[in-house]
Structure formats: structure tokens, C-alpha cells
């Protein structure tokens, strides 16, 4: 998920006098913005850890890889990267860790070649539904995005303004069906409690989906059926208790899939029988020999692959008349 980079020795820093001398004129084609490093040979501009509060206006037209990490951007307004002439070559944009809390509709408009976008490690309390689609039409022009990295974008709990964070993110992913070509989606470390059921069906080109380190309890209402190209599904470090038959069958039906399930609190009772049977037969789960029970207490740390049906019992539920106080 990282973009190509170039060695620091090939970068030229902007001269302060140059920046001020041309501030009132259109940018020169090979100009480097103040506080950035530029390599025309590598088509790369790095404005990293410079406390920038706005996207530089004078980005060179040749830029293909733009790193704007570790800044103080706060807001990405509409057309934040719109330039005349446009940044027609810009393919990889990394905005991680730049204290963004608001991304407005059309923030990435006029970037016809943008394939990789990384917004990780920004507390996105206000992500417009039209941040990626650019318009509120029911069907927007297709986005060129192929890779969207949204790891750890959840704001602090008291800053979510009583809205569903999952819902806000999914609205941005689905608006206008603009992201039909998306192949990689990373949503790790976002405290997701659930995955809205329609999200995957509308991202049919996905090859890699990372949902690790969330708080997903169940996949019962999530369908993977349409994701025929899916190659990797990361579900490590969630709160999954069991995978049911429907999910198991759908995963087994995906031709290229590898699933990662480590570090979930599996509940090894009678409901786990189907999953254990499936695990013993399937090749799709990576590191399946590492999966262990968390509950009930008597089963803690037992390896799932070593269980048999006799191990997987459920305590009988007494009818109300037989229950004692």
C-alpha cells in the first residue's frame, strides 16, 4: 500500500527567495513548493512533517507521487488539488497523520489519474458522503481510485456527534457508485462494531479487504458472494465468536481467497461445530492451526483444529418453571 519513493539525495529543496519571488505568478513547471522536497526524475514531491496548514498551491505539474504526511491540514476543501493546468499525472497521494478532521465533497476532484489514496491516522469526524465521488448524483463519473487506505481514521468516541461512524464511512464508499473499480480497501483499527450489509456488494472489484483490529462481533448479515476477485480478507483482532454456515459457504466459494482470522475470541460451544468441520477441510484460512478458543472458560486456549463434536456442547437452557432463583 506504499507509493514509490526516491532517495533523499535526488531531491531539491525549494529556495525561500524563489517561493516569495513567484508567489504572485503562476507556478513554474519545475518549481518546488516551500517546505517541500521535489524530484522531477522520480516524479515525487514530499512535504513531510512540516506543519503545513493547507495543501501547497504551487505543486509542480509533473508530480506523480505526493506525500503530505505529518502536517496540520485539518480540512480538505472541495477541489483541494484542483490546479490549472490540472495535476494530470498525480497517481499516489498520501495524507496520513495530517490531523485532518474534515474532508469535504469533491476534495479529490480534478485528479484524473489518482489511483492510490491514503488518509490513515486522521480523526475523520466529518467525511462527506461525496468526498470520493465528487458529486451528489445517484451515479457519478467513475473514480480512478484503485487503492483506498483508511486505517485508524476513527475520531475519539466523544467526537462522533451521535452519528454512526460505520455509516458515515460506508456512505462515502458507496456514493454515486464511483468506486466500482476499487481493488484494495483498508479499514483497519476503526472500532467498527458491524459492517453495513450493502457495502461489499457494491465494491465488486475488490481484491484485498482489511478489516483487522476492529470490534466486529458477527458476519451473519455480510455477503461475500459478489466478491469473486477477492484474494485477501483480513479479520484478525476483532470480536468474532463464530462463523456460521452461510458465511463459510460463501468464503469457500471464492476462487482466490485467503482469510486471516487470528486473535478473535472464538466461542467453542455447540454453535462452533460447523466452523471446526470447515476449518479442518478448507485451505483458505491462513494460519488456521493458530486459532484457539477464548470461551467458555473450560475451553480456553484449546486449538480449534483439535476439537471434535464431543468437545462442543451447549449447556441446556432450563425452562422457566425449572429455573431456581
Amino acid at each position: 500500500s506504499s507509493s514509490p519513493t526516491s532517495s533523499a539525495s535526488s531531491f531539491s529543496s525549494s529556495a525561500p527567495f524563489l517561493a516569495s519571488a513567484v508567489s504572485a505568478q503562476p507556478p513554474l513547471p519545475d518549481q518546488c513548493p516551500a517546505l517541500c522536497e521535489c524530484s522531477e526524475a522520480a516524479r515525487t514531491v514530499k512535504c513531510v512533517n512540516r506543519n503545513l496548514t493547507e495543501v501547497p498551491t504551487d505543486l509542480p505539474a509533473y508530480v506523480r507521487n505526493l506525500f503530505l504526511t505529518g502536517n496540520q491540514l485539518a480540512v480538505l476543501p472541495a477541489g483541494a488539488f484542483a490546479r490549472r493546468p490540472p495535476l494530470a499525472e498525480l497517481a499516489a497521494l498520501n495524507l496520513s497523520g495530517s490531523r485532518l478532521d474534515e474532508v469535504r465533497a469533491g476534495a479529490f476532484e480534478h485528479l484524473p489519474s489518482l489511483r492510490q489514496l491514503d488518509l490513515s491516522h486522521n480523526p475523520l469526524a466529518d467525511l462527506s458522503p461525496f468526498a470520493f465521488s465528487g458529486s451528489n448524483a445517484s451515479v457519478s463519473a467513475p473514480s480512478p481510485l484503485v487503492e483506498l487506505i483508511l486505517n485508524h481514521i476513527v475520531p475519539p468516541e466523544d467526537e462522533r456527534q451521535n452519528r454512526s461512524f460505520e455509516g458515515m464511512v460506508v456512505a462515502a464508499l458507496l456514493a454515486g457508485r464511483a468506486l466500482q473499480g476499487l481493488r484494495r480497501l483498508e479499514l483497519a483499527s476503526n472500532h467498527f462494531l458491524y459492517l453495513p450489509r450493502d457495502v461489499l456488494a457494491q465494491l465488486p472489484s475488490l481484491r484485498h479487504l482489511d478489516l483487522s483490529n476492529n470490534s466486529l462481533v458477527s458476519l451473519t448479515y455480510v455477503s461475500f458472494r459478489n466478491l469473486t476477485h477477492l484474494e485477501s480478507l483480513h479479520l484478525e483482532d476483532n470480536a468474532l465468536k463464530v462463523l456460521h454456515n452461510g458465511t463459510l459457504a460463501e468464503l469457500q466459494g471464492l476462487p482466490h481467497i485467503r482469510v486471516f482470522l487470528d486473535n478473535n475470541p472464538w466461542v467453542c460451544d455447540c454453535h462452533m461445530a460447523d466452523m471446526v468441520t470447515w476449518l479442518k477441510e478448507t485451505e483458505v484460512v491462513q494460519g488456521k492451526d493458530r486459532l484457539t478458543c477464548a470461551y467458555p472458560e473450560k475451553m480456553r486456549n484449546r486449538v480449534l483444529l483439535e476439537l471434535n463434536s464431543a468437545d462442543l456442547d451447549c449447556d441446556p437452557i432450563l425452562p422457566p418453571s425449572l429455573q431456581t432463583s
Epitope: N51, Q72, A74, V75, R99, D101, P155
Partner: nanobody
Framework: QVQLVQSGGGLVQAGGSLRLSCAAS????????MAWFRQTPGKEREFVAA????????RYTDSVKGRFSISKDNAINTVYLQMNSLKSEDTAVYYC???????????????WGQGTQVTVKP
């Protein structure tokens, strides 16, 4: 409308320090940015520093960079301006402000504190 109540300020020798506080009566979700401005007689209010409530992004006018520091305490809806290495040209009435934008113009801010005098003796 949110009420902004300022405290701090006063008279200080050049090279000294002061801390200003600005407490919001409630945390307005519509006001995403808190800022400090200053004004000297006959001049327009000048932007000094700003901070975002959520992301904590900060920005400063060039003349105070490295000397002033803006911070916030979300739990008590309060913003601070720590002013070090004060110069006589920092003498002004300082105002805190709340607004939606991530801007440096006073028109970006809708709610204002009452102002507090800072005087730096040469």
C-alpha cells in the same frame, strides 16, 4: 450562540511569559476551530493562532511561531494561549474566537470573547 469567557493577561516585562485562557460555555459542534486574535488601536484584528477541537491541528501567524503555543482541553471546553519570549510589539487586546472554518480571517469566526489586555514593557 456560545459564550466565550477569557482570563489571564496583564502587564509583563519583555522576555517574560503569560498564559491566556478561553472557556466556552458549551462545546458547540458547529464551531470546529478555536482561535486567538489581537488588536491594537486603529488597526484591524490580527490572527495569532488557531486549534481544531477534534484533530488538534494548530496554526500560527509567522511573527509568533516558536514563541506562542495554542492548546486545548476538550474535557472542560477550554483553549489556552501560552505566550513566551514576549516582545513590546505583542502588546494588544487579545480575543478568543470560535468558528467553523480553518481560516485566519476574522470573518471566519462567529463567536468572540470579551477581550483581555496584554501589555509588554520594554
Amino acid at each position: 450562540q456560545v459564550q466565550l469567557v477569557q482570563s489571564g493577561g496583564g502587564l509583563v516585562q519583555a522576555g517574560g511569559s503569560l498564559r491566556l485562557s478561553c472557556a466556552a460555555s458549551r462545546r458547540p459542534f458547529s464551531s470546529k476551530t478555536m482561535a486567538w486574535f489581537r488588536q491594537t488601536p486603529g488597526k484591524e484584528r490580527e490572527f495569532v493562532a488557531a486549534v481544531r477541537w477534534i484533530g488538534g491541528a494548530t496554526r500560527y501567524t509567522d511573527s509568533v511561531k516558536g514563541r506562542f503555543s495554542i492548546s486545548k482541553d476538550n474535557a472542560i471546553n477550554t483553549v489556552y494561549l501560552q505566550m513566551n519570549s514576549l516582545k513590546s510589539e505583542d502588546t494588544a487586546v487579545y480575543y478568543c474566537a470560535a468558528g467553523q472554518a480553518w481560516g485566519t480571517k476574522f470573518t471566519d469566526y462567529s463567536d468572540w470573547g470579551q477581550g483581555t489586555q496584554v501589555t509588554v514593557k520594554p
